[in-house]
């Protein structure tokens, strides 16, 4: 005979686990049902009635099974320097990233607590390390026979043109100015040419950061007396 | 067997504040909730809040926000309850009572009659 | 705030009759209710949780029912240290909040 599918709550066999989605409650010593993501147990098992789930209220969440008494708080809205990149619902946290320009530098479980602008590079300083949502521009001085003229946290030093007849030479801020009108070379890919050329600048943009999907867990969750019930093992 | 024993009576006057406590023996005192419930005399029982002593999470009524300030010293398993700017309408016995959810509570401490009065 | 209405306020009962007590909220709890029994100068105690689930240790002659807004707490057969009063709560809606009580007397 096949063996009987036990239904919560039950006694687990000595040794033995509860199920995918149960938890063991010490208090009643059985195997009980979890709640699902977006639910919160209102009513604990006993020996001879299951949980009670409920849904969570406005604001909170739960985003694993789980037999928490409360749900989660959702985090406070994004600040200004922020964009929302997933809602709080029943199921999720809200999730905060820095808008573009910025970097993010106080981080948290998902999202980010504490946005910074990326740094601007002056005249004279190129981008050396390009920022990214976790870290900020890092600026060099531009190298001889390099400049930047522009105050940014995207343009790199660019080699100075190179003139048949120099008219002024470039430094680590301004580039190079020719006599000529037809230098002999420009490193500045479209730069217009008129008596004293001006380079056009290409403009890097900031990549959107990407928001992060690692599951929450709640160290700040009021547990019961059982093991921890968000974030635990068991789908 | 779970027990929940609170401080003495108090007599205070209007303005002044008061401090009950409400120390836990024989559970998992950072594993349940504590609630504060008040009673004036010969009047039925009103919710005040509670505290999570696990993550110190509290809760409080609306009507006693900011008077009501709820604290636990989990290394005395002791629960406070302090209610501030007293008023004569706050005679009352007050309890704490324990619960594992947060909505029934199934063990009480013996009461603690606070007397406000000029 | 939900308001919670308990109907007697009293009663009188001899020893060995079926007494019912019932309680009304001003909304849907969704069987989110408790009952308490609180004896003079004592703290109250736990009888039913969840409109019907027993707490341990209480008599089974104690029962509870009801849904919706309509709520019952019966004795089926009382006992001498049965005479208290009573009182429902709810747990659907922050703040909780209790009934008025229902004292039951000896007759």
């Known amino acids: 005979l096949p063996a009987q599918v036990a239904f919560t709550p039950y006694a687990p066999e000595p040794g033995s686990t509860c199920r995918l989605r149960e938890y063991y409650d010490q208090t009643a010593q059985m195997c009980c049902s979890k709640c699902s993501p977006g639910q919160h147990a209102k009513v604990f098992c006993t020996k001879t009635s299951d949980t009670v789930c409920d849904s969570c209220e406005d604001s909170t969440y739960t985003q694993l099974w789980n037999w928490v008494p409360e749900c989660l708080s959702c985090g406070s809205r994004c600040s200004s320097d922020q964009v929302e990149t997933q809602a709080c619902t029943r199921e999720q946290n809200r999730i905060c990233t820095c808008r573009p320009g910025w970097y993010c530098a106080l981080s948290k479980q998902e999202g980010c607590r504490l946005c910074a602008p990326l740094r601007k590079c002056r005249p004279g300083f190129g981008v050396a390390r390009p920022g990214t949502e976790t870290s900020d521009v890092v600026c060099k001085p531009c190298a001889p026979g390099t400049f930047s003229n522009t105050t940014s946290s995207t343009d790199i030093c660019r080699p100075h043109q190179i003139c048949n007849v120099v008219a002024i030479p470039g430094n680590a801020s301004m580039d190079a100015v020719c006599t000529s009108t037809s230098p002999t070379r420009s490193m500045a890919p479209g730069a217009v040419h008129l008596p004293q050329p001006v380079s056009t600048r290409s403009q890097h943009t900031q990549p959107t950061p990407e928001p992060s999907t690692a599951p929450s867990t709640s160290f700040l969750l009021p547990m019961g007396p059982s093991p921890p019930a968000e974030g635990s093992t068991g789908d | 067997q779970v027990q929940l024993v609170q401080s003495g009576a108090e007599v205070k006057k209007p303005g002044a504040s008061v401090k009950v406590s409400c120390k836990a023996s024989?559970?998992?005192?950072?594993?349940?909730?504590i609630h504060w419930v008040r009673q004036a005399p010969g009047q039925g029982l009103e919710w005040m809040g509670w505290?999570?002593?696990?993550?110190?999470?509290?809760k409080y009524h609306e009507k006693f926000k900011g008077r009501v300030t709820m604290t636990a010293d989990t290394s005395t398993s002791t629960a406070y309850m302090e209610l501030s700017s007293l008023r004569s309408e706050d005679t009352a016995v007050y309890y704490c009572?324990?619960?594992?959810?947060?909505?029934?509570?199934?063990?009480w401490g013996q009461g603690t009659l606070v007397t406000v009065s000029s | 705030d939900i308001q919670m209405t308990q109907s007697p306020s009293s009663l009188s009962a001899s020893v060995g009759d079926r007494v019912t007590i019932t309680c009304r909220a001003s909304?849907?709890?969704?069987?989110?209710l408790n009952w308490y029994q609180q004896k003079p100068g004592k703290a109250p105690k736990l009888l039913i949780y969840?409109?019907?689930r027993l707490h341990s240790g209480v008599p089974s002659r104690f029962s509870g029912s009801g849904s919706g807004t309509d709520y019952t707490l019966t004795i089926s057969s009382l006992q001498p240290e049965d005479f208290a009063t009573y009182y429902c709560?709810?747990?659907?809606?922050?703040?909780?909040?209790f009934g008025g009580g229902t004292k039951v007397e000896i007759k």
């Open positions: 505290i999570y002593p696990g993550n110190v999470i509290t």
């Open positions: 969840y409109t019907s």
């Open positions: 909304q849907d709890i969704r069987n989110y």
């Open positions: 024989d559970y998992s005192f950072t594993n349940y909730y």
């Open positions: 009572a324990r619960s594992r959810a947060t909505g029934y509570f199934d063990y």
């Open positions: 709560q709810q747990f659907n809606t922050l703040p909780w909040t």
